[in-house]
């Protein structure tokens, strides 16, 4: 790497993925293995991130840009850059300090993360419930009362309400 | 480079913001970023850090949750509110910067200086 | 909480010598260690971080190795200009609740 040229920062010329080492008289020096620099004209280079345990690597590091991580089969990152990997739950459950727990009667959870949060509530809209909720789907609202008077398009009536099996919290 | 602003001379009890502005770089790139402080004469101990990333994660040593308060108030800025303070806190704040996801700081600030006495 | 505990508090060494510093931290941090130089009236510097990998432009003269509970710092043909205090510091970001970091105590390093 030449030594830069600039009168006014030395420094300012030395490209993404060097730095300019002090050490040696400002010339532009590589990253050492395991870092970056993605701007140029920098005096030290970032900490390439490591991907580990329950993170695996999605993109490498290299000279100019730091790695990226996801999260391991069973697992599902939190926050932007994957900073946490967070245990997947099955729908119908959350995860709580002691584990997966099925959601609650009157809530659901229809992916492998989150919370259980409350069924729809129809009547609030004036409509009825349609289909029941589970654990895992909240309830489809249908017409209200009102809409289904004789001679109305047939809605075939829901099957009869069953409580979805869940565990003491 | 970093630079700490805020340290003052200020009474038990009082509270005060430090700010640490980034410069050659700005938040778009996600990093974590940190405060460290030293008493005099004394060694290094972490207070906390944020995440610059859109979730803004915030991590603070055990000692220093509910008195200290770390965010994000622009890209090329991090500040650090502190409560309640007593003469213990009198020390030397740092601000740092983490790329790795695990406590290694390549970038540190000179320091801003915070002495509690009455 | 992670403790890292920094052993010896203070070395002695003549120039060209070498120093060990050793770190152990209370629990399992794999690779997760860095080593910092402070110099009196300056911030600390990075010298290794993922307990083996050398900063951007620290001399070759430091070394780092260790994993898991035990770490060591190599100091060989000690200069003048590595008189200073050197900390290691471990720790992993798990979750807003549950974080580790924390820096040893300090080793003064004194050239004669």
């Known amino acids: 790497f030449e030594r830069t040229r600039s009168l006014q920062d030395p420094c300012s010329n030395c490209p993404a993925g060097t730095f300019c080492d002090n050490n040696r008289n400002q010339i532009c020096s590589p990253c050492p293995p395991n870092s970056f620099s993605s701007a140029g004209g920098q005096r030290t280079c970032d900490i390439c991130r490591q991907c580990k345990g329950v993170f695996r690597t999605r993109k490498e590091c290299s000279s100019t840009s730091n790695a990226e991580c996801d999260c391991t089969p069973g697992f599902h990152c939190l926050g932007a850059g994957c900073s946490m990997c967070e245990q997947d739950c099955k729908q119908g459950q959350e995860l709580t300090k002691k584990g997966c727990k099925d959601c609650c009667f009157g809530t659901f959870n229809d992916q492998k993360r989150g919370i259980c949060r409350p069924w729809t509530n129809c009547s609030l809209d004036g409509k009825s419930v349609l289909v029941n909720g589970t654990k895992e789907r909240d309830v489809v609202c249908g017409p209200s009362p009102a809409d289904l008077s004789p001679g109305a398009s047939s809605v075939t009536p829901p099957a009869p309400a069953r409580e979805p099996g869940h565990s003491p919290q | 480079s970093l630079e700490e602003a805020g340290g003052d001379l200020v009474k038990p009890g009082a509270s005060l913001t430090l700010t640490c502005t980034a410069s050659?770089?700005?938040?778009?790139?996600?990093?974590?970023m940190c405060w460290v402080r030293q008493a005099p004469g004394k060694g290094l101990e972490w207070i906390a850090c944020?995440?610059?990333?859109?979730?803004?994660?915030t991590y603070y040593a055990n000692w220093a949750k509910g008195r200290f308060t770390i965010s994000k108030t622009s890209s090329t800025t991090v500040t650090l509110q502190m409560t309640s303070l007593t003469a213990a806190d009198t020390a030397t704040y740092f601000c740092?910067?983490?790329?790795?996801?695990?406590?290694?700081?390549?970038?540190w600030g000179q320091g801003t200086l915070v002495t509690v006495s009455s | 909480a992670l403790v890292m505990t920094q052993t010896p508090a203070s070395v002695s060494a003549a120039v060209g010598g070498t120093v060990t510093i050793n770190c152990q931290a209370s629990?399992?941090?794999?690779?997760?260690l860095a080593w910092y130089q402070q110099k009196p009236g300056q911030p600390p510097k990075l010298l290794i971080f993922?307990?083996?990998d050398l900063a951007s432009g620290v001399p070759s003269r430091f070394s780092g190795s260790g994993s898991g509970t035990q770490f060591t710092l190599t100091i060989s043909g000690v200069q003048c200009d590595d008189a200073a205090t050197y900390y290691c510091q471990g720790g992993y970001y798990t979750s807003s609740t549950d974080t580790r970091g924390a820096f040893g105590g300090g080793t003064e390093v004194v050239v004669k």
């Open positions: 993922y307990a083996s």
């Open positions: 050659g770089f700005s938040f778009t790139s996600s990093y974590y």
């Open positions: 944020i995440y610059t990333g859109s979730s803004g994660s």
């Open positions: 740092a910067r983490d790329s790795s996801s695990y406590y290694m700081f390549n970038l």
């Open positions: 629990e399992d941090i794999d690779n997760y």
